[in-house]
């Protein structure tokens, strides 16, 4: 059982109230986290409540206001970045969102030493990406798909690339598919540790098919949005990696980094770049058929001014049971010798664990092991390695932080977080200062989130950074639902589930059940985290039981479960939701005539297929922005799990796994289909095709579109969406309004 904030005694229960939909839409019970913006081993920046930028020194106990809210306000700055030499700050304003990570903005450079904005050679606008060098105050930025360099903020810029062109050539920033499905960043340039070199990617999208959709806006004629977007099997971007010497950028110009021969022989991806030293860089490449990844360590050759990637420094990672890696191929964390590294990949038992690679992957030394998974390597110092895993007490939906002493033999392991606030905190992340002198722990639950500061040597807690006291007080008179995380054992498969139960839950009564599903490959829904959200309201106020189930294809429980869905998406994810529902009915408190399922994105796909499974289990369901055919989704994501939609590969399952193929089966369920018309990610096309198939089959259904909204359905659309879905579910479950 997962404990929630403490309850008052029954005598006071009449002062307690249920959650309202308004509470959720207003964000009344949202929590805060505190991630220090580390600038050294012992200092971090933080924006104070009154919007001053304040430097905190943990060692001296002093805090210094380095930038006033007045200066921030003078340019309407919403973000800032301090140069490593502490002389300048960039101020970011006019934020304009593009895709998931990308945005453009206007940048102003403020000289902290003299308290003035840098005049002369101001930056152009809008800029697509800007960053300081790791040392000093050099600037690299991307403007109109080209990269520019400034030695000092007031200097004229040096133009590094000249071929940048909208929707054609992208320098230093990713195109749509690399941003969303490979890099998960808005940038594609990387400074070397001391700022000597700048590496960058060039993406050529010239031959990629374009997705076009209408943006209605307020004008007489809608605009057409065009995005080079490779769908499954389509032509992909062509990527090249270059490195330029930023001290003498005009001397030899950008030098291309060679692609490993075994990768270059067919379509491939670049997956990440990690600088090791100023003259050593590590690139990761991936075949288009994403079960082979190559890590290539390259060295600068002073005599030729080129980058050399010897075959002896190529490390191959291959999966024979699925795709390479988890969601992404993991990145290496190099040790102090600048050649050996730590990396997470599957061990012989099919669990993702930390390995130490000194010469070859075959000779890797396994650092962690067990029937659980190492999830993230946070930091490697000369004597410690900090990582997170779900080992503790065998709950896959937990995250604890561990320290392995690598300076001693044999290495000893210590759980830093397991017993800190055991009931309140079972799901942590961490943020480390330079050399791990200090670190912040951010606990996400299951209790109210709390952020704390710790000594990196002793792990001693120094202070609480954020404990959400206001939230705790606000929740004192709220009847929150109860939550439990348990597992079902079915046919040698473990199905972990989270059940959210009404506050006065009584096992002898019958409750309507709502399944909330995501279910995408390498995802996890059953997590020990705090949330007061829409489903909390449905349990608290409307008396529903809500369940989340992690079935086959989900993460952090070993490769057998993860890779079970390889090349057959849409089968086992759906089966496992159905299996779980049958088990929930057997528990005796579910009204089997009132069962619904809903999901968003991949969850919309699964919920649609579950509704169309012909089991008769579900009375109704909702799909928000669903994928309806894998032929409509992005190549990088789809092909990772499904292979190619060609006859000699996996076309048959691409065709068999569509929602449209099951149109007839929607006849006996109430289906609500929802999509934003400006969804750049899961195109409106997906829902348009479902709707067409349902109409052609003469099946009645409900639908809602959100004009000019993307995959997130944000702003006022969010309120409308949840209100609409609430009405739909209440009608389905015959609950009075």
């Amino acid at each position: 059982i997962v404990l929630r904030p403490s309850r008052v005694h029954n005598s006071e229960e009449n002062t307690m109230r249920a959650l309202t939909l308004k509470d959720i839409l207003n964000g009344t019970f949202s929590y805060k986290t505190f991630f220090p913006n580390w600038i050294s081993g012992q200092e971090y920046l933080h924006q104070s409540a009154d919007n001053n930028i304040v430097l905190y020194n943990i060692e001296t106990g002093q805090s210094y206001t380095i930038l006033s809210n007045r200066t921030m306000k003078s340019v309407n700055a919403s973000n800032y970045g301090l140069s490593p030499d502490r002389q300048f700050v960039y101020l970011e304003s006019d934020y304009s969102k593009l895709w998931r990570y990308s945005y453009t903005a206007t940048y102003y450079i403020y000289d902290l030493s003299n308290g003035e904005f840098v005049r002369g050679n101001e930056l152009p606008r809008p800029i697509q990406y800007l960053c300081w060098s790791p040392v000093g105050s050099k600037l690299a930025y991307v403007y109109q798909n080209n990269i520019y360099l400034k030695q000092r903020p007031g200097d004229p810029p040096f133009q590094i690339t000249f071929n940048g062109r909208e929707n054609k050539i992208f320098n230093g920033i990713p195109d749509w598919v690399y941003e969303e499905e490979m890099l998960a960043t808005k940038y594609a340039l990387w400074w070397s540790p001391n700022g000597k070199f700048l590496a960058y990617a060039e993406f050529n999208d010239t031959d990629i098919p374009v997705i076009a959709y209408s943006y209605y806006g307020d004008e007489q004629y809608p605009r057409t949005i065009n995005i080079p977007y490779p769908k499954a099997g389509a032509k992909n971007p062509v990527v090249r990696i270059f490195i330029i010497d930023t001290t003498y950028p005009a001397y030899v110009g950008p030098q291309e980094v060679p692609v490993p021969a075994m990768i270059a022989s067919s379509d491939y991806y670049f997956s990440w770049l990690t600088w090791v030293t100023d003259e050593r860089v590590c690139l990761q490449w991936l075949k288009r058929v994403q079960n082979v990844s190559v890590l290539s360590i390259c060295d600068f050759r002073e005599d030729w001014q080129t980058w050399d990637c010897p075959k002896t420094q190529e490390h191959i990672e291959e999966s024979r049971t699925g795709w390479a890696g988890g969601f992404f191929v993991s990145t290496p964390v190099f040790s102090y010798d600048a050649i050996s590294y730590y990396k997470i990949f599957s061990d012989k038992d099919g669990y993702k664990h930390i390995h130490y690679i000194k010469d070859t992957v075959e000779n890797a030394i396994q650092i962690t092991s067990g029937k659980w998974e190492a999830i993230n390597i946070f930091r490697v110092t000369q004597d410690s390695l900090f990582y997170s895993s779900n080992e503790f007490e065998e709950y896959p939906g937990r995250r604890n932080i561990y320290r392995i002493s690598i300076g001693s033999y044999p290495p000893s392991k210590k759980c830093v977080t397991c017993h800190l606030r055991k009931e309140r905190c079972q799901y942590y992340t961490a943020s480390f200062s330079d050399y791990a002198k200090y670190y912040a722990l951010v606990c996400y639950g299951p209790g109210i989130p709390i952020s704390t500061l710790h000594d990196g040597r002793t792990d001693q807690e120094i202070k609480i950074l954020e404990e959400n006291k206001e939230l705790e007080n606000a929740l004192k008179n709220i009847q929150l639902p109860k939550e439990e995380i348990k597992k079902l054992e079915v046919d040698e498969i473990t199905l972990w589930y989270k059940m959210i139960l009404p506050p006065q839950f009584d096992r002898s009564k019958k409750y309507p059940l709502l399944i909330q599903v995501y279910g995408g490959p390498c995802s996890q829904s059953v997590r020990s985290v705090f949330a007061v959200n829409w489903i909390s309201y449905l349990a608290s106020k409307e008396g529903m039981v809500i369940a989340l189930v992690d079935g086959r294809g989900t993460a952090f429980q070993g490769d057998k479960l993860l890779y079970a869905v390889y090349r057959k998406l849409g089968v086992y994810e759906v089966e496992d939701q159905i299996t779980a529902v049958r088990k929930f009915i057997e528990m005796g408190f579910i009204d089997e005539k009132r069962i619904a399922i809903w999901g968003w994105s991949y969850g919309g796909y699964v919920s649609s297929l579950a509704l169309a499974s012909g089991t008769g289990l579900f009375k109704c369901g909702i799909a928000v922005a669903p994928v309806s055919s894998w032929e409509y989704y992005a190549s990088v994501y789809t092909e990772r799990f499904m292979g190619l939609p060609t006859k000699d590969d996996n076309l048959e399952h691409y065709k068999n796994s569509t929602v449209m193929a099951r149109a007839e089966y929607f006849r006996n369920v109430d289906y609500l289909l929802i999509h934003g018309t400006a969804d750049d990610n899961v195109h409106f096309q997906n829902s348009a095709q479902i709707a067409k198939a349902l109409v052609n089959a003469q099946v009645d259904f409900q639908a809602m579109w959100y004009s000019d909204q993307n995959h997130g359905l944000s702003g006022l659309s969010t309120n409308h969406l949840y209100t609409h879905m609430t009405h739909f579910l209440k009608q389905c479950f015959s609950l009075s309004d």
Epitope: E59, T60, Y64, I66, S68
Partner: antibody
Framework: EVQLVESGGGLVKPGGSLRLSCVAS????????MNWVRQAPGKGLEWVGH??????????DYAAPVKGRFTISRDDSKNTLYLHMNSLKTEDTAVYFC???????????WGQGTLVTVSS | DIQMTQSPSSLSASVGDRVTITCRAS??????FNWYQQKPGKAPKLLIY???GLQSGVPSRFSGSGSGTDFTLTISSLQPEDFATYYC?????????FGQGTNLEIK
């Protein structure tokens, strides 16, 4: 250009008082932590004290020899730092410099100094 | 209070010489440590910050090292304009004490 200009020095009798001023320009004075440092004739540098910015609480710290006798204050509207010196002793004779404490923990800009002579 | 002990108190050297001045703190100050140069009748000038950081505009012949309690200022090749008095200072905690100074004069 950053400038610090001290004034107010002069000859004063033991037990007397004096107020030194330091006018700042070329930087955001209101956010700066400001210091006084002195140098007795032919001797080394001696830190006198500092005042934090109002945003950081505006508190002061002093070296032991001057604590209780000297007071540092600031007027951000005039970009001016003050050193109020009471119960002056002959050993307070020195050139007094004002300087800015930049938050990478250095005294990065200094005034030219003003001479205070305490003598009967 | 943290005491700063600087040595030597005076030093004679010739143009082109390599010169080293040391400073010891009475307790660990990590890298909260700076070097200043002062010429007669002038205000001190910052040379090295955070034990080893070269202040902008200062010639690269000046370098600093050390951490904790022991620190060193090195001038790799003395130039005529380097003859001056050098002070170390801790900025770990107030009072921000100075060393007693090293007077570098022409031999």
């Amino acid at each position: 250009e950053v400038q610090l200009v001290e004034s107010g020095g002069g000859l004063v009798k033991p037990g007397g008082s004096l107020r030194l001023s330091c006018v700042a320009s070329g930087f955001t004075f209101s956010l700066a932590w400001m210091n006084w440092v002195r140098q007795a004739p032919g001797k080394g540098l001696e830190w006198v004290g500092h005042i934090k910015s109002r945003a950081d609480g505006g508190s002061t710290d002093y070296a032991a020899p001057v604590k209780g006798r000297f007071t540092i204050s600031r007027d951000d509207s005039k970009n001016t730092l003050y050193l109020h010196m009471n119960s002056l002793k002959t050993e307070d004779t020195a050139v007094y410099f004002c300087s800015r404490f930049y938050w990478n923990y250095v005294l990065d800009y200094w005034g030219q100094g003003t001479l205070v002579t305490v003598s009967s | 209070d943290i005491q700063m002990t600087q040595s030597p108190s005076s030093l004679s050297a010739s143009v082109g010489d390599r010169v080293t001045i040391t400073c010891r703190a009475s307790q660990s100050i990590n890298s909260y440590f700076n070097w200043y140069q002062q010429k007669p009748g002038k205000a001190p000038k910052l040379l090295i910050y955070a034990a080893s950081g070269l202040q902008s505009g200062v010639p690269s012949r000046f370098s600093g090292s050390g951490s904790g309690t022991d620190f060193t200022l090195t001038i790799s090749s003395l130039q005529p304009e380097d003859f001056a008095t050098y002070y170390c200072q801790q900025s770990y905690s107030p009072p921000y004490t100075f060393g007693q100074g090293t007077n570098l004069e022409i031999k």
